[in-house]
């Protein structure tokens, strides 16, 4: 290299990461194998679970505002789960990103998109529940499935917008031991006149903004919404509905537990720019907490099922339908079985939040599956007496 050739500028913390060399330690090898196995399993589970949740909630349940929130959460988790196999491959080839810079940017962006989308959607769920209790008349008039989808669309747009810097500043960096990192390179675009200042300010801005926007603000909204609901229901002398509260509480708790450590280490990493002593702690901890954040997408579907008995019932029914469709005669399939069901109007008033965990009667058998395959998955099943009763209440 000529004396005047300026090397690719890297922030000190990133350059030091590029200098870290792999160990051939046997115990570390076992940990690597276990990590590959664990992430591989999580990839498979995440894809299957979220796929099933999307099918069950989107196709086997009556569309309500609540099912809309869950649908979008599951979609976000499915995206994250779809990126997990590539992270597993990264681990399997010895912690080296062999899939190119563009895919490095895309893969990382999915992780951050899921982070923002999850935070925003959980905030929306809490605000929605709060509005139902605090402004019941307004909620009665304005809470529609169409409105919920529009809100989700706005939230997705905001999540994409917040993900842009992570796409822009993601890069592949060659380590001195030959491995390739897929990591932040905040000097990638317009490094400015002083690299040290740019490194410190940009890394801090990224860490603090994601902590605030994707974690602290959503949790503050969730906490204040919960407090407002609890106060209002106490004044009314009513017990709050159990099931939906349990579902939201479980999902929020999982979100806080899975993403909390990630944000702590992300903030520590920003501090490590000025305090090199923190770097080893960050290097050791970040891979673990990043995986924990990924696993949130695998945990959520389990929580939906565990906190919602009806979800499990519908899940069993759906799986039986799939088996029946494999065994059924072609003649029995006849004309698409979706004719006896009507599609839910996009502006139809939604049921209470309990509708997600209610038990509407619905058509069974292969006709239902074929109807779904032919594109009428949003068709509304016949509403059972319990669901009708629940629909008339406001939680």
């Amino acid at each position: 290299m000529s004396a005047n050739a300026t090397l690719k500028p890297l922030c000190p913390i990133l350059e030091q990461m590029s200098r870290l060399q792999s160990h051939s330690n046997t115990s570390i090898r076992y940990i690597d194998h276990a990590a590959v196995l664990l992430h591989g399993l999580a990839s498979l589970l995440g894809l299957v679970e979220n796929g099933v949740i999307l099918f069950v909630v989107g196709c086997r349940m009556r569309q309500t505002v609540v099912t809309t929130w869950v649908l979008h959460l599951a979609l976000s988790d499915l995206l994250a789960s779809a990126s997990l196999p590539f992270f597993t491959y990264f681990l399997a080839v010895g912690h080296s990103w062999e899939l190119g810079t563009t895919f490095c940017k895309l893969h990382s962006s999915i992780f951050f998109l899921n982070m923002f989308a999850s935070g925003f959607l959980l905030s929306a769920i809490s605000l929605d529940r709060c509005l139902q209790v605090v402004r019941p008349v307004w909620a009665q008039n304005h809470r529609t499935v169409a409105a919920a989808h529009k809100v989700c669309l706005v939230l997705w747009a905001l999540a994409v917008l917040n993900t842009v810097p992570y796409f822009v500043f993601r890069d592949t960096i060659s380590r001195l031991d030959g491995r390739i990192m897929c990591y932040y390179n905040v000097l990638l675009l317009n490094p400015g006149p002083d690299r040290d200042a740019t490194c410190n300010s940009r890394q801090a801005a990224l860490a603090v903004s994601k902590f605030l926007l994707a974690f602290l603000v959503p949790l503050a909204i969730i906490a204040s919404s919960h407090a407002a609901v609890s106060l209002r229901l106490q004044h009314r002398g009513r017990r709050r509905p159990g099931r939906f509260v349990r579902l939201v509480a479980a999902v929020v708790a999982a979100f806080a537990l899975c993403w909390g450590p990630y944000h702590v280490f992300s903030l520590l990493e920003a501090r490590a720019h000025a305090n090199p002593g923190l770097r080893p702690l960050v290097w050791r901890g970040l891979p673990f907490v990043t995986s924990l954040a990924f696993f949130n997408s695998v945990a959520n579907p389990v929580l939906y099922v565990l906190t919602c008995p009806d979800m499990l019932r519908k899940l069993r029914r759906s799986l039986r339908t799939v088996l029946e469709s494999v065994l059924v005669d072609d003649s029995e399939l006849g004309g698409a079985g979706s004719s006896r069901r009507r599609r839910t109007s996009s502006t139809a008033r939604s049921a209470s939040p309990l509708a997600l965990c209610s038990r509407p009667e619905e058509p069974r058998g292969p006709a239902r599956l074929l109807g779904w395959l032919l594109g009428s998955c949003a068709a509304s099943p016949q509403t059972g007496p319990l669901n009708r009763a629940l629909s008339s209440t406001s939680s």
């Epitope: 004396a3 090397l7 500028p9 030091q16 200098r19 400015g192 002083d194 690299r195 040290d196 090199p276």
Partner: antibody
Framework: EVQLVESGGGLVQPGGSLRLSCAAS????????MSWVRQAPGKGLEWVAR????????DYPGTVEGRFTISRDNSKNTLYLQMNSLRAEDTAVYYC???????????WGQGTLVTVSS | DIQMTQSPSSLSASVGDRVTITCRAS??????LAWYQQKPGKAPKLVVY???QLADGVPSRFSGSGSGTDYTLTISSLQPEDFATYYC?????????FGQGTKVEIK
């Protein structure tokens, strides 16, 4: 060809001040971090100061902190070391050095001798 | 501050000999180590950076190795121009300290 030429050294009394300069050429000066390193006669090397490429960040070891100030003028391709409250133990050959990236001094000047004596 | 201890402080060797100089840090420096060669009356010259990487224009008979706190500079076959003083320096946490030097002399 990369060239670093130090100047400003000489004899100074204890408690006195001196300003060293390092003229850089043959490379894009504003793209590189720079440092000053000194070597007492017959002794080893000691890192004295470091400055970021834009001049916003500086670092010093405890032995010189508060007495020495590193600065740079990117328009003049020049690095400076302002030395105040000089002591006998500051007597050394002072080298300016270019950082390869964030560390590692890949090019050094020929050095300038600073003698602190009464 | 991190202390860098070089050994030996001096050694006598013949042309063609294999020479090994070690540098021990008082704490883990994560491969953030450089080796310099200095000849009398001259400025130091970078030989190895990041513990294992050979600097531009440095002959392949020089090599760096090590990890954690222990690092080594090896000259596989000593040449007449290699007789000099060698210094290690860490770049982990400031202040960036040097080893006291190892003088390689002709036997």
């Amino acid at each position: 060809e990369v060239q670093l030429v130090e100047s400003g050294g000489g004899l100074v009394q204890p408690g006195g001040s001196l300003r060293l300069s390092c003229a850089a050429s043959g490379f894009t000066f504003s793209s590189y971090l720079m440092s000053w390193v000194r070597q007492a006669p017959g002794k080893g090397l000691e890192w004295v100061a470091r400055i970021s490429n834009g001049g916003s960040t500086t670092d010093y070891p405890g032995t010189v902190e508060g007495r020495f100030t590193i600065s740079r003028d990117n328009s003049k391709n020049t690095l400076y070391l302002q030395m105040n409250s000089l002591r006998a133990e500051d007597t050394a050959v002072y080298y300016c050095a270019r950082h390869r990236t964030n560390w590692d001094f890949d090019y050094w000047g020929q050095g300038t001798l600073v003698t602190v004596s009464s | 501050d991190i202390q860098m201890t070089q050994s030996p402080s001096s050694l006598s060797a013949s042309v063609g000999d294999r020479v090994t100089i070690t540098c021990r840090a008082s704490e883990n420096i994560y491969w953030n180590l450089a080796w310099y060669q200095q000849k009398p009356g001259k400025a130091p010259k970078l030989v190895v950076y990041a513990a294992t990487q050979l600097a531009d224009g440095v002959p392949s008979r020089f090599s760096g190795s090590g990890s954690g706190t222990d690092y080594t500079l090896t000259i596989s076959s000593l040449q007449p121009e290699d007789f000099a003083t060698y210094y290690c320096q860490h770049f982990w946490i400031t202040p960036w300290t040097f080893g006291q030097g190892t003088k390689v002399e002709i036997k």
